[in-house]
């Protein structure tokens, strides 16, 4: 396996609707046609896969139907969006990129994006 550099922002703040977006950029050493992107969450000293998608260069990322992730690709950048986040989902979200085809296989792991999620305050009841 050959190593590849993966860059991602250090910190992202989720929106009030629990949506966080960030770019995962990889330094592709060749012309990959098949790429796999995996997002893993690190919290409480444990890593767990959040979502994964394999895509052909030039095509859209396809996550599973029940995935909380969506994304688009542009060249060597993947724009990832994670939805349905709550305060308890705050953590380090790590981008792992694999160039699956053609050989040789390349793998890179980003340093992670710390996503902060703040649950919105409930609206006070209004008397009209």
């Amino acid at each position: 396996c050959k190593a590849m550099h993966v860059a991602q922002p250090a910190v992202v703040l989720a929106s009030s609707r629990g949506i966080a977006s960030f770019v995962c950029e990889y330094a592709s050493p060749g012309k990959a046609t098949e790429v796999r992107v995996t997002v893993l969450r690190q919290a409480d000293s444990q890593v767990t896969e959040v979502c994964a998608a394999t895509y052909m260069m030039g095509n859209e990322l396809t996550f599973l139907d029940d995935s909380i992730c969506t994304g688009t690709s542009s060249g060597n950048q993947v724009n990832l969006t994670i939805q349905g986040l709550r305060a308890m989902d705050t953590g380090l979200y790590i981008c792992k990129v694999e160039l699956m085809y053609p050989p040789p296989y390349y793998l890179g792991i980003g340093n992670g994006t710390q996503i902060y999620v703040i649950d919105p305050e409930p609206c006070p009841d209004s008397d009209f």
Partner: antibody, heavy 118, light 106 residues
Amino acid sequence: EVQLVESGGGLVQPGGSLRLSCAASGYSITSGYYWAWIRQAPGKGLEWVSSISGSGSTTYYADSVKGRFTISRDNSKNTLYLQLNSLRAEDTAVYYCARDGFGYFDYWGQGTLVTVSS
Amino acid sequence: DIQLTQSPSSLSASVGDRVTITCSASSSVSYVYWYQQKPGKAPKLLIYDASSLESGVPSRFSGSGSGTDFTLTISSLQPEDFATYYCVQGLQTPWTFGQGTKVEIK
């Protein structure tokens, strides 16, 4: 070509400490991968022990060693360390360091034997 | 933690035999790797992503499976293939290994 060379193993009494080293060459330990320690007790299978991120900011441990072992690195020496404290007989094993792509361990050292015995 | 169970634990086979080793996960995993280990040596990566052959590994080795059930196949066993084989999952920490399958000479 990536090469990993472990050292620091030896005989230690229960409750004692050791520091294992893993010197990497052919690749910077700060680049694009995690780094792991994996052990193998005599005649037994493989057990993942700990991993550290390329940035050094993130560490993970197996429950069996959490609070007793500490993984670290020295970028200037391109070296990975595992500090073993409060050692028990069941920690007796060959300890390997490996380049870690989240379970994808593509380069391994030759291993260093740690024996915990009175 | 995700548990990996390999079967069989050991097997005896002859040169030229087709050998199949299975790895069953306690929950669905997307990343499975296969390693070969010879006595006194460090493990060697054979298969990544369940079915992709690591560079330099002979084509007689192949991997398949998804979800919870995975298989390593050696199509025609060679003398240098007598060793212990391990599967590993990379879905979540702790990264867990199967208990190993020892392939011995019949």
